[in-house]
């Protein structure tokens, strides 16, 4: 037997206990699929959250964060304060990255500079609080008499010749 509630469209809710089963969702509530037993209350984007998409009778509101904050979690469930590049967010606020670490974004933690020597390479450009070090060729590649490597010429695409 087909559930009579399956005839109720999105934007309505269904009550099995009544002859007339479909009712419209009240203001500020929604049902995103047919056959729902209840309408869900619309999410309200308040405080540090701002509305990215308004609620409708068939879909929930979507929030993002006000300037100076960024989303965390599924569906932007939290807003976290932005920091400057070269900083990370701690319990006491934004703090500069310690020497030997960097952060090139407004969010996240300071990460250690790449250790070029682990790959047998030298430091080409020093790191800063905002940027990682740039590793260069290995010291052996820089010794006198080392041949320079020429990149190969690009292969011609097979198939079509000029018309």
């Amino acid at each position: 037997l087909q559930d009579p509630c399956s005839n109720c469209p999105a934007g309505t809710f269904c009550d099995n206990n009544r002859n007339q089963i479909c009712s419209p969702c009240p203001p500020n509530s929604f049902s995103s699929a047919g056959g729902q037993r209840t309408c869900d209350i619309c999410r309200q984007c308040k405080g540090v959250f701002r509305t990215r998409k308004e609620c409708s009778s068939t879909s929930n509101a979507e929030c993002d964060c006000t300037p100076g904050f960024h989303c965390l979690g599924a569906g932007c469930s939290m807003c976290e304060q932005d920091c400057k590049q070269g900083q990370e967010l701690t319990k006491k606020g934004c703090k500069d990255c310690c020497f030997g670490t960097f952060n090139d974004q407004k969010r996240g933690i300071c990460r250690p500079w790449t250790n070029c020597s682990l790959d047998g390479k030298s430091v080409l450009v020093n790191g800063t609080k905002e940027r990682d070090v740039v590793c260069g060729p290995s010291p052996a590649d820089l010794s006198p008499g080392a041949s320079s490597v020429t990149p190969p010429a690009p292969a011609r695409e097979p198939g079509h010749s000029p018309q």
């Epitope: 469209p9 009544r18 009712s23 419209p24 969702c25 009240p26 203001p27 308004e54 409708s56």
Partner: antibody, heavy 114, light 107 residues
Framework: EVQLVESGGGLVQPGGSLRLSCAAS????????MHWVRQAPGKGLEWVAY????????YYADSVKGRFTISRDNAKNSLYLQMNSLRAEDTAVYYC???????WGQGTLLTVSS | EIVLTQSPATLSLSPGERATLSCKAS??????VSWYQQKPGQAPRLLIY???NRYTGVPARFSGSGSGTDFTLTISSLEPEDFAVYYC?????????FGGGTKVEIK
């Protein structure tokens, strides 16, 4: 800003036909069911018809069933009410409203008279 | 269909007074009752939904209460702009229905 603007009303003879339109803006029209509600001069409000957001579900008041047809064009953000076999008692201001019944248009007057 | 009966039909009050409007349903409608304000030549304006929730931008002097079959709209202290006709409506089941209205007029 949410706006609903009805049009198409006028004077029609009994037995005649007319199509009302409702142009929606300021919200995602395709995500809302829509209603037509009418108000006879000096009288109360009477619900006329409902259409779901995708147009698959439609309900009518008994007083208009078989004579009126509600439809929508989500690409044009428009709602319609095709009215046939009009009677004197259909004379009213016709309002369109979102399914939350929170926003209403300004209404368009239909007069059925010979 | 569900019949909504509003009383009184007319309420004559002065600005600053308290207005109490009643709406009775012919059968249980849960809390699916809304209240609307209508002024001459204008469309209805939603004031209260879900029996007691004030809609966005509606002044705090408007409040709604009730559930089941008995509902009340209260205007705590009438302002000059509050003199209008008030309708209750139910969205518990189709057909949606409205009460006959209560006119709040200046005494």
């Amino acid at each position: 800003e949410v706006q609903l603007v009805e049009s198409g009303g006028g004077l029609v003879q009994p037995g005649g036909s007319l199509r009302l339109s409702c142009a929606a803006s300021g919200f995602t029209f395709s995500e809302f069911g829509m209603h037509w509600v009418r108000q006879a001069p000096g009288k109360g409000l009477e619900w006329v018809a409902y259409i779901s957001s995708g147009g698959s579900t439609i309900y009518y008041a008994d007083s208009v069933k078989g004579r009126f047809t509600i439809s929508r064009d989500n690409a044009k953000n428009s709602l319609y009410l095709q009215m046939n076999s009009l009677r004197a008692e259909d004379t009213a201001v016709y309002y369109c409203a979102r399914d939350w019944v929170d926003y209403w248009g300004q209404g368009t007057l239909l007069t059925v008279s010979s | 269909e569900i019949v909504l009966t509003q009383s009184p039909a007319t309420l004559s009050l002065s600005p600053g007074e308290r207005a109490t409007l009643s709406c009775k349903a012919s059968e249980n409608v849960g809390s699916y009752v809304s209240w609307y304000q209508q002024k001459p030549g204008q469309a209805p304006r939603l004031l209260i939904y879900g029996a007691s929730n004030r809609y966005t931008g509606v002044p705090a002097r408007f409040s709604g209460s009730g559930s089941g079959t008995d509902f009340t709209l209260t205007i705590s202290s009438l302002e000059p702009e509050d003199f209008a006709v008030y309708y209750c409506g139910q969205s518990y089941s189709y057909p949606l229905t409205f009460g006959g209205g209560t006119k709040v007029e200046i005494k």
